[in-house]
């Protein structure tokens, strides 16, 4: 489940140029826009993912209150600077010189600033929660039905670990799912939580990232699963900073 | 570490059983845990898996609704089967993931037989 | 997600060599494994990842394949490899019948 040898792609990005360049002629994958070698064994990281969207064509309440400090993402797409592992530098810049901090999954989590804007760490975002409204069905879903199914696919689908799920919410419409992954937690080879959110996301959206893999097809004893809304907040080791007059 | 199945019996038709599998110098909460049973002179048969985070059990579609699965203390985890045949005459193993996202199993206990007969 | 594999049964000499090989009724994207089982004894993984080799097992054991199609290689045959061996695909559990192949006997004469 590295690079496919047969016919040279990556399976789990399609966002990548392939060839037989490797050692021994193996098959190498390089993302587009970073043109960095991707494990094709593992999802890519969503710096990676983002800089190659932006370079390609453009075409009794059970549910969690997001703190204070969540974040959601309002910012959009743009084009990041990802360091030599894949992941988000701290500081963003835009071409005019208006820079800012993000989080590790590239969140902006500052005020926008100057040049003279200092990001000194980048700040893990360990907790996110999923929130989607699914389309009417007959009837609520199952409650453990879907929490085993929405496991399931995180670690199938995304290999994520179901510790890494901590909890699956449901009151009808709204699903939640809860990512929590702290650094100490997270060994060498595990999926980031931010990614496999990312990769969740646009398989929401109908736009999936995998190679040759069908698109999402998520049902509960035979009941598709269909999402209207998705909506994502990010919480972070430690707390934005944002000025006061955001929050107006 | 180690996995030790308890439980197997000689049974008539129609009666419930549960076996347990006690694990042994791990933590259990890092791995999913399966039960797979051969029936004498044949081949592995999936029955069913716990992810321990969360608790969720998954089934071979054969086995959904006679068969569960869950973890009763930090240790074990029993696999209870209700309306028992003969066809469930097996020994019945309980084996541990590799701690991964895929169902690699690196760790099996010696298994446990099960014998269903008047 | 149906695993067959062939043959049931095969016979080779010491320092022979034999095949095995398993196909996923569906693409399994080489998350496929191999175990050993001698009689009285639970399965011991032999290899993962279609190719990778278990700890502590030797290297004339060699995985392959991808897609839907894999095989297992057992070159220089010794007594101690007679045994039964499953492939099982390690990709998905959700709707399935089994995981495991259906065996190969492995007699070395």
């Known amino acids: 489940h590295t690079a496919a040898q047969d016919n040279c792609t990556c399976p789990t990005n399609k966002m990548t140029v392939c060839s037989p360049d490797g050692p021994g002629g193996r098959c190498q994958c390089r993302a587009l826009g970073s043109g960095m070698a991707v494990d094709c064994s593992t999802l890519t990281s969503k710096c990676l993912l983002l800089k190659a969207r932006m370079s390609a064509p453009k075409n009794a309440r059970t549910l969690v209150r997001p703190s204070e400090h969540a974040l959601v993402d309002n910012d959009g797409l743009y084009d990041p600077d990802c360091d030599p592992e894949g992941r988000f530098k701290a500081r963003q810049c835009n071409q005019t010189s208006v820079c800012w901090c993000v989080n590790s999954v590239g969140v902006r989590r500052t005020d926008k600033g100057d040049l003279s804007l200092r990001c000194d760490e980048l700040v893990r975002t360990h907790h996110i929660l999923i929130d989607l409204r699914h389309r009417p069905t007959a009837g609520a879903f199952n409650h453990s039905d879907l929490d085993a199914e929405l496991r399931r696919l995180f670690r199938e689908r995304y290999r994520l670990h179901p510790k890494f799920v901590a909890a699956v919410h449901y009151e009808q419409p709204t699903i939640q799912i809860e990512l929590r992954q702290n650094t100490s937690q997270k060994a060498a080879g595990d999926v980031d939580i931010g990614d496999a959110a990312y990769y969740f996301e646009r398989d929401i959206k109908g736009e999936s990232l995998f190679q040759g893999r069908g698109g999402l097809d998520l049902r509960v004893r035979g009941e598709p699963l269909q999402v209207e809304r998705t909506l994502i907040y990010y919480l972070d080791e430690i707390p934005p900073k944002f000025s006061m007059k955001r929050l107006t | 570490q180690s996995l030790e199945e308890s439980g197997g019996d000689l049974v008539q038709p129609g009666a419930s059983l549960t076996l347990t599998c006690k694990a042994s110098?791990?933590?259990?909460?890092?791995?999913?845990m399966l039960w797979v049973r051969q029936a004498p002179g044949k081949g592995l048969e999936w029955i069913g898996c716990?992810?321990?985070?969360?608790?969720?059990t998954y089934f071979a579609s054969w086995a959904t609704g006679r068969f569960a699965i869950s973890k009763t203390s930090s240790t074990t985890v029993t696999l209870q089967m209700t309306s028992l045949t003969a066809a469930d005459t097996a020994t019945y193993f309980c084996?541990?993931?590799?701690?991964?996202?895929?169902?690699?199993?690196?760790?099996w206990g010696p298994g446990t037989l099960v014998t269903v007969s008047s | 997600y149906d695993m067959t594999q062939t043959p049931a049964s095969v016979s080779a000499a010491v320092g022979g060599t034999v095949t095995i090989k398993c196909q996923a009724s569906?693409?399994?994207?080489?998350?496929l494994a191999w175990y050993q089982q001698k009689p009285g004894q639970p399965p011991k993984l032999l290899i993962y990842?279609?190719?990778d080799l278990a700890s502590g097992v030797p290297s004339r054991f060699k995985g392959s394949g991808s897609g839907t199609e894999y095989t297992l290689t057992i070159s220089a045959l010794e007594c101690d490899d007679a045994a039964t061996y499953y492939c099982?695909?390690?990709?998905?559990?959700?709707?399935?019948?089994?995981?495991f192949g259906g065996g190969t006997e492995v007699v070395v004469k």
């Open positions: 084996a541990r993931d590799d701690g991964s996202t895929s169902y690699y199993l690196n760790l």
């Open positions: 110098g791990f933590d259990l909460n890092n791995y999913a």
């Open positions: 716990i992810y321990i985070s969360g608790g969720t």
């Open positions: 569906e693409d399994i994207y080489s998350l």
């Open positions: 990842d279609a190719s």
């Open positions: 099982q695909q390690a990709y998905t559990i959700g709707n399935i019948d089994n995981t």
